[in-house]
């Protein structure tokens, strides 16, 4: 056969569907490939070929549109599935072509279970919902062109295993699920269950998706430097392990880029010669809040570096902030019996300030 | 660590009613949902419903339509199991168990409740 | 509903014997199956979730295999404390269901 550019397998689209659903899949070729779409491609004189391999097998063999019941179609650039089973699982290829030109592409299709509760390996969109915000609502996804406008569909919401109705904070209003005022509590997986007939028959839609409560843009303020402080000095000897946390707290903030950045001298450390390291650790609230904590260490401190400025900065989309660490060298110690002579009391260190050894 | 404490046994007349409580301690009551399962003496175990205790709702085996009603009291973390119009196979001993709302395992257990169903 | 077949209905073993435990669906569950295992006048544990996922505590000789339509736990070394009745539980469809129980008892 004649060349045809072959854009492979195209895996960034891993399609899921659950069995025994109606599916409908797009050939991806007009979606993310070709600059034209079916109908222009089609007025070309152009076909639209479907076949596949399924799973564990290398064969390519056509896909059969003559099953009863029309259980597997195509119309215009959509393969029909009416309904799934378990083992439609494979490799779908779509190919557009005619006597000059050719092009094609394969995807993954894999049918999966589901349990009574919706468990399943689908994997499942997050929808984040701001705590205590007022109405927000979230919509069943991916239920468009499965049913004409003029057929009125119903749809059950579930969050887990349970049926939503009545209830005082979510309430089901057809494809919307409403918020009333989102808690903590709101977290977990709900799922539309859109059920609607054609031609005789009665079809289901199941769309899963994750709720997540998180921080509210209301409460939301610029990072916050709880370390380096005041309250603590860093005082070493020369020779000595010298360890500064930066610990900054971050609002939820919607597609923020939250930044923790130290400096020495005003210098980024990679753009100095002294030999530092930094470790990052990351923790998140219930609500998304975050915690960055920065660990800068320096093995060996030598009395230069202990004049030197070290200064940790943040930065979100909420603003930018800077806090300089306290760093002195300890002051030996006066001997006892130079103390005696001068007529001083042992006294200690007496500098007040907190010595901290991080280990 | 999670408790499940089930009321104490009970002795029933046939046609009568019983209802079981089970009191959750030790997690987020409405984080999770709360099973019925029931054992009949040296029998196995027979799943009779459960109840989500955020929304109240239930799902109910179709063995116990219409005799069973479960609910949930969030202010007091207890569940209830209300089974009507007894007869002497439903003498059993009753246990609640915990799952999520998304769980189909039941990760705790109650101590398990004695009916028995005698004239 | 789906029916769970357990067999043998009893294990006669020694502490320290494998013992084979199967559960077996009257139709796909996928891996959506519980095993428990319960003692005389004890509420039932959970030890298998997932039909090959340990529950928290419980020990590594506990395992769970199988997809579909048969699934197997298995105890590697019987302990003294394994002796008990062991149930698997499919959650796949309403209402769920337990198997009839395998009795494990010292030979």
């Known amino acids: 056969s004649e060349r045809c550019d072959d854009w492979g397998l195209d895996t960034m689209r891993q399609i899921q569907v659950f069995e025994d659903e109606p599916a409908r899949i797009k050939c991806p070729l007009f979606e993310h490939f070709l600059k034209f779409n079916y109908s222009t491609a089609h007025s070309a004189g152009l076909t639209l070929i479907w076949y596949w391999t399924r799973q564990d097998r290398d064969l390519e063999e056509p896909i059969n549109f003559r099953l009863p019941e029309n259980r597997i179609s195509k119309e215009k650039d959509v393969l029909w599935f009416r309904p799934t089973l378990l083992n439609d699982t494979g490799n779908y290829t779509c190919m557009l072509r005619n006597t000059t030109y050719c092009s094609k592409v394969a995807f993954p299709l894999e049918v999966v279970q589901k349990d009574s509760c919706f468990n399943s390996p689908m994997k499942l969109p997050v929808h984040k919902l701001y705590i205590e915000y007022g109405i927000q609502r979230i919509t069943c996804p991916n239920v468009d062109g499965y049913f004409p406008s003029s057929v009125k569909p119903t749809i059950t919401w579930y969050m887990g295993c349970y049926k939503i109705q009545n209830f005082n904070n979510v309430i089901p209003e057809g494809m919307n699920l409403s918020f009333l005022i989102a808690l903590i509590s709101n977290n977990g997986n709900y799922t539309c269950v859109v059920t609607y007939p054609e031609n005789g028959r009665t079809f289901h839609l199941t769309r899963t998706l994750t709720v997540k409560v998180v921080g509210s843009p209301k409460n939301a303020v610029p990072p916050v430097i709880h370390s380096p402080n005041d309250h603590v000095v860093y005082e070493k000897e020369p020779g000595e392990e010298l360890l500064i946390p930066c610990t900054v707290y971050f609002s939820f903030l919607m597609d923020s880029r939250n930044e923790v950045w130290w400096t020495i001298d005003g210098k980024k450390p990679d753009d100095i010669t002294i030999d530092v390291t930094i470790n990052e650790s990351i923790s998140h609230s219930r609500t998304e809040d975050e915690t960055r904590t920065q660990i800068l260490s320096i093995k060996k401190v030598t009395s230069e570096d202990l004049k030197r400025s070290y200064v940790c900065h943040a930065r979100s989309a909420k603003g930018e902030v800077a806090k300089a660490a306290k760093v002195k060298q300890k002051v030996p110690a006066p001997r006892y019996t130079v103390e005696l002579a001068c007529g001083f009391g042992a006294t200690g260190s007496g500098s007040g300030s907190h010595h901290h050894h991080h280990h | 660590q999670v408790q499940l404490v089930q009321s104490g046994a009970e002795v029933k007349k046939p046609g009568s009613s019983v209802k079981v409580s089970c009191k959750a301690s030790?997690?987020?009551?409405?984080?999770?949902?709360i099973s019925w399962v029931r054992q009949a003496p040296g029998q196995g175990l027979e799943w009779m419903g459960g109840?989500?205790?955020?929304?109240?709702?239930?799902n109910y085996a179709q063995k116990f339509q219409g005799r069973v009603t479960i609910t949930a009291d969030e202010s007091t973390s207890t569940a209830y199991m209300e089974l009507s119009s007894l007869r002497s196979e439903d003498t059993a001993v009753y246990y609640c168990?915990?799952?999520?709302?998304?769980?189909?395992?039941?990760?705790?257990w109650g101590q398990g409740t004695l009916v028995t169903v005698s004239s | 509903e789906i029916v769970l077949t357990q067999s043998p209905a009893t294990l006669s073993l020694s502490p320290g014997e494998r013992a084979t435990l199967s559960c077996r669906a009257s139709?796909?569950?996928?891996?959506?199956l519980a095993w428990y295992q319960q003692k005389p006048g004890q509420a039932p544990r959970l030890l298998i979730y997932?039909?090959?996922n340990r529950a928290t505590g419980i020990p590594a000789r506990f395992s769970g295999s199988g997809s579909g339509t048969d699934f197997t736990l298995t105890i590697s070394s019987l302990e003294p404390e394994d002796f008990a009745v062991y149930y698997c539980?499919?959650?796949?469809?309403?209402?769920?269901?337990f198997g009839q129980g395998t009795k494990v008892e010292i030979k």
């Open positions: 030790g997690g987020t009551f409405s984080s999770y949902a």
């Open positions: 168990a915990r799952h999520l709302h998304n769980g189909i395992h039941l990760d705790y």
């Open positions: 109840i989500s205790a955020i929304f109240g709702t239930a």
């Open positions: 139709q796909s569950v996928s891996n959506f």
């Open positions: 539980q499919q959650g796949k469809h309403w209402p769920w269901t």
């Open positions: 997932g039909a090959s």
